[in-house]
């Protein structure tokens, strides 16, 4: 028997959405090989409609696809927009149409259940609401009206303009009898259940003469909309619940193999801790949508979500809900790397971005993930140059080393910096990416001075200490701006006496300021790197004052005093409330995203890097 | 909590059918997968046939031993499952279980399924 399996009969009706899933072995030789659905004809031979090559028939065109997880060796095939000539004969299979690995399945496509004549059909969500409408003659006008249910040959009254209402209802449903001249009634139920799926009969008067309309209504189970991200990725659930909401406490919850729904997040501040630091509820629009981002997409993501409004922010039955069934695929095209970086206080780190590599020319982001209520991640920089007002002079974004990673380094650090921070572009949302910052017990590897007065004029040399292990690496100052930091010229200084138990291989690199300028004042960064991949920074500030005393000003490797967790706020660099507000770029309207969970090191450059899950910014 | 209630097993002779029940109660409108297992005396627990729902939408699975034979469906309105056995041969003696299950990676795998019933026993004499 063939070692393919998939489900042998799938019935649907016109105009719906069918997801088969076929599996099979996941060998090497299966994984890799041609997928393909196909429909048997009479002549006995299988036409392919689509197959994991990319074929779509024309037939199909627009409206099915397949695809291929072969980690869990299953494949989907999607069809939309079904029809009654899609009933038959098809077969799922790997390799060639006419060998014997495939699976039989039967479609019929229906077209729905027969009605009386005349019959309105109203096809609603659960938990919407619904307004069957009931026309009546002018001689019933005065008369009583009523909605019933009908439930095989009996029918159950609902409610009537006699103030009846059935208890099943109660609290959810009102009749509503127009202005003279109007020859409708309404009758309005909201928060629909599954249990009031059926026909209904309109009734105005009674006797031979009274008006009837029958009306059809179909609750439905919101049919879960397929995602497909991949590992590493993002995802954003869009949840559009309508106004009848609008003001309602809103969540996001996983459906549990116990039936229940763990909240994940709600607008009432709770949060699964699984997913912090990596998510966000977008604020509300005025329509009651919201989405909510979810980054760092681990295989233990996949599953049922639903998004709904109660007022408990928990779901309840009755109440409005979309679904989505994700799944998390994990030949992803979103590079591995850290999802923690380790620096030290006082020290910096190095984090690697990844970003679509088609999309060079995107605006690259940085933002702060902060927990608070719904979760919300203000800029903190951006490729265009804007900085956040406290992070001038220690944190900057660069483009190296490019083709598809972008550079964020932070320097000066303190435990204030510890947390979760974001990567994103204006482009491709799929490649968002989440890295946490924790700060570690040590020393910064690199030794600046911790205050720098420079005269008008004169010469300035400021020394940085480096390591000998960092000898290989290519050293710099740069001049930090709020658009980058431009490369100054420097020069290797020899042995210091910075490192003892490295002697002779202690290096001290310096920079010189010759004359000094009033453009000179600012931060300045002593770094190191190896080609394009930025190591440790050390950042010092350059005041300019007037000339006092003649004579050149060097500041030797004796007041390099730079201690590990002073932080000079000097020159309009103060600490201020961060007053970021949501950056609406993050929210702008998207397609599914993906974030590449596993961020880059602080100390990329470093030999002594450690594993590829964590790795630190300054390195003992 | 999910309540699953097998009924309708019972002793027949090879060649007669049988139609086993599950009833769901305490069900949340999230279930979309219900399925039959069987365990033969002596036997592990063995997938028979799977029904899963979206919508309107149905995709019914069975094991190869009962294809043809054994037919699943569903009554919404009852949150009952139906298992319709004809030609029923010996080696269908088992208890018969019900599962079910809010999301389908795999319907064939027992470790798919949260809530299960007490079993109905199914007995076929030759």
């Known amino acids: 028997k063939s070692p393919v399996f998939g489900p042998q009969e799938v019935s649907s009706v016109e105009g719906n959405s069918v997801s088969i899933k076929c599996y099979y072995p996941p060998t090497s030789v299966n994984r890799h090989t041609r997928k393909y659905w196909c429909r048997k004809g009479a002549s006995g031979r299988c036409i392919t409609l689509v197959s994991s090559e990319g074929y779509v028939s024309s037939n199909y065109a627009g409206r099915a696809n397949l695809t291929n997880f072969p980690e869990n060796g299953t494949f989907v095939v999607n069809i939309a927009q079904l029809s009654r000539d899609d009933s038959g004969h098809y077969k799922c299979g790997l390799g060639i149409n006419s060998r014997g690995l495939s699976f039989d399945v039967s479609l019929e496509v229906s077209q729905g259940p027969e009605l009386p004549n005349g019959t309105e059909v109203y096809t609603v969500d659960v938990g919407r609401t619904v307004t069957i409408k009931c026309p009546f003659k002018t001689e019933n006008a005065p008369k009583t009206k009523a909605l019933y249910k009908k439930i095989g040959q009996t029918s159950v009254l609902v409610i009537d303009s006699r103030n009846y209402v059935n208890p099943n209802y109660k609290d959810r449903i009102r009749l509503r009898i127009p202005g003279t001249g109007q020859l409708i009634f309404t009758v309005v139920i909201d928060r629909l259940r599954l249990s009031d799926h059926g026909l209904y009969l309109c009734q105005a008067g009674d006797g031979s003469n009274r008006d009837e309309k029958n009306a059809d209504l179909q609750v439905l189970e919101p049919e879960p909309e397929l995602v497909y991200e991949d590992l590493r990725g993002s995802v954003t659930f869009h949840c559009a619940l309508g106004l009848e909401v609008a003001n309602v406490a809103k969540f996001l919850c996983r459906v549990n193999s116990r039936e229940t729904c763990d909240v994940v997040i709600n607008t009432l501040g709770k949060r699964d801790s699984a997913f912090e630091g990596r998510i966000l509820l977008n604020p509300q629009d005025k329509d009651g949508s919201f989405s909510v981002v979810i980054t760092g997409l681990r295989k233990e993501d996949e599953g049922r979500y639903l998004c709904g409004a109660h007022s408990d922010g928990q779901l309840q039955e009755g109440w409005p809900i979309q679904a989505w069934q994700l799944f998390v695929n994990e030949e992803s095209t979103i590079p591995r790397s850290p999802t923690v970086v380790k620096g030290v206080a006082g020290g910096s780190v190095a984090v690697l971005c990844p970003y679509n590599p088609k999309e060079s020319q995107s605006l690259k982001y940085w933002c702060l993930w902060e927990g608070a209520q719904n979760g919300r991640c203000p800029l903190l920089v951006e490729s265009q140059g804007l900085v956040q007002e406290q992070y001038e002079g220690r944190l900057s974004l660069l483009q190296e080393p490019g083709n598809g990673t972008f550079t964020v380094i932070l320097n000066q650090l303190t435990t204030q910096d510890a947390g979760f921070y974001w990567c994103l572009t204006n482009g491709d949302t799929r490649w968002r990416t989440t890295v946490e910052i924790k700060i570690i017990e040590g020393e910064p590897n690199l030794k600046v001075p911790g205050n720098v007065t420079a005269v008008l004029g004169e010469t300035l040399n400021i020394p940085c200490h480096f390591p000998c292990k960092f000898s290989s690496y290519e050293k710099y100052w740069c001049k930090w701006s709020n658009t980058g930091c431009q490369t100054l010229p420097s020069q290797d200084e020899g042995p210091s006496e910075a490192f003892v138990n490295c002697d002779e291989n202690s290096r001290l690199v310096s920079l010189t300021l010759n004359p000094v300028t009033r453009a000179d004042e600012g931060w300045y960064w002593c770094g190191v790197k190896q080609g394009h991949f930025y190591g440790e920074t050390a950042a010092v500030y350059v005041a300019v004052e007037e000339k006092k005393v003649a004579g050149s000003r060097y500041v030797s490797p004796a007041k390099a005093d730079a201690a590990p967790d002073e932080k000079v706020l000097d020159s309009g660099v103060r600490e201020i409330e961060n007053k970021a507000i949501q950056d609406p770029r993050l929210f702008a309207e998207e397609k599914v995203v993906a974030d590449t969970g596993d961020q880059a090191g602080g100390s990329r450059a470093s030999v002594d890097s450690s594993s590829s899950e964590e790795q630190g910014g300054s390195s003992k | 909590e999910v309540q699953l209630v097998e009924s309708g097993g019972g002793l027949v002779q090879a060649g007669d059918s049988l139609r086993l029940s599950c009833a769901a109660s305490g069900r949340t409108f999230t279930t979309y997968v219900m399925g039959w297992f069987r365990q033969a005396p002596g036997k592990e627990r063995e997938f028979v046939a799977t029904?899963?729902?979206?919508?309107?939408?149905?995709?019914?699975y069975y094991a190869d031993s009962v294809k043809g034979r054994f037919t699943i469906s569903r009554d919404n309105a009852k949150n009952t499952v139906y298992l319709r056995m004809n030609s029923l041969k010996p080696e269908d003696t088992a208890v018969y279980y019900c599962?079910?299950?809010?999301?389908?990676?795999?319907?064939?795998?027992?470790?798919?399924?949260?809530?299960w019933g007490q079993g109905t026993l199914v007995t076929v004499s030759s």
């Open positions: 599962a079910a299950s809010t999301v389908l990676t795999d319907p064939r795998r027992l470790n798919e399924y949260a809530n």
């Open positions: 029904i899963a729902w979206s919508g309107s939408t149905n995709y019914k």
